[in-house]
């Protein structure tokens, strides 16, 4: 015999209390597939989460993060704070990039400046906490007497910086 519940479409549930009639999902609940015996409670986007997509009878709400935060985890289950450019997020909050490293985004870690000398080039523009160095022509290509900026100090490996 065919299960009468299999006829219940998404957005309804098979109500055992009413002779397995297909009943609409109650407010603030949904069923995304047919044949469900219960409806799932809609996700609520509260606090630092904001609603990206409202819950409907057939699909859950979707959240993202309020300005100043970005999503982490499956389905934006967490909101992580943004830092400023020139900083990285550590376990104890946003910290400035150490000398010799930069971060040009609001998330992620500080990365070492490019070592221009490895490519046989000179530093055209010094690096900052927010920007990588700009490498110029090789020193040999520079006209006599042209000044060259001192290459940056060796940078630490990401993940092993002192505070």
């Amino acid at each position: 015999l065919q299960d009468p519940c299999s006829n219940c479409p998404a957005g309804t549930f098979c109500d055992n209390n009413r002779n397995q009639i297909c009943s609409p999902c109650p407010p603030n609940s949904f069923s995304s597939a047919g044949g469900q015996r219960t409806c799932d409670i809609c996700r609520q986007c509260k606090g630092v989460f904001r609603t990206r997509k409202e819950c409907s009878s057939t699909s859950n709400a979707e959240c993202d993060c309020t300005p100043g935060f970005h999503c982490l985890g499956a389905g934006c289950s967490m909101c992580e704070q943004d830092c400023k450019q020139g900083q990285e997020l550590t376990k104890k909050g946003c910290k400035d990039c150490c000398f010799g490293t930069f971060n040009d985004q609001k998330r992620g870690i500080c990365r070492p400046w490019t070592n221009c000398s490895l490519d046989g080039k000179s530093v055209l523009v010094n690096g900052t906490k927010e920007r990588d160095v700009v490498c110029g022509p090789s020193p040999a290509d520079l006209s006599p007497g042209a000044s060259s900026v001192t290459p940056p100090a060796p940078a630490r490996e990401p993940g092993h910086s002192p505070q």
């Epitope: 550590t90 376990k91 104890k92 870690i109 505070q163």
Partner: nanobody, 124 residues
Framework: EVQLLESGGGLVQPGGSLRLSCTAS????????MSWVRQAPEKGLEWVSS????????FYADSVKGRFTISRDNSKNTLYLQMNSLRAEDTAVYFC?????????????????WGQGTTVTVSS
């Protein structure tokens, strides 16, 4: 598939205690440092505590130092967080997190897998 499953959350009165557990599967548990991270209703993620793969090194946020204890049982693939002297401000969803190597510190996030979280509510 790498999975982390938290349990032990609930409603507790201020001054009370709870012990959270996180059961890991899909990887060699003892090879990786683990962390607890929480998200309060109106705030972003806050790191709580980390423990090295061997359990020999532990680190705590200043806000929980002396009240919370992180531990692990590598034979059971389980991470724990013993929470004592709970306060209203400890109310949050607590996430278990796997770090990318066996060592850890109180500086760098190195998380590559998150659990789904367990809710802790501290209220009278």
């Amino acid at each position: 598939e790498v999975q982390l499953l938290e349990s032990g959350g609930g409603l507790v009165q201020p001054g009370g205690s709870l012990r959270l557990s996180c059961t890991a599967s899909g990887f060699t548990f003892s090879n990786y440092a683990m962390s607890w991270v929480r998200q309060a209703p109106e705030k972003g993620l806050e790191w709580v505590s980390s423990i090295s793969g061997s359990g020999g090194s532990t680190f705590y946020a200043d806000s929980v130092k002396g009240r919370f204890t992180i531990s692990r049982d590598n034979s059971k693939n389980t991470l724990y967080l013993q929470m004592n002297s709970l306060r209203a401000e400890d109310t949050a969803v607590y996430f278990c997190a796997k770090e990318g190597s066996s060592e850890t510190d109180d500086h760098y996030y190195n998380v590559d897998v998150w659990g789904q979280g367990t809710t802790v509510t501290v209220s009278s």
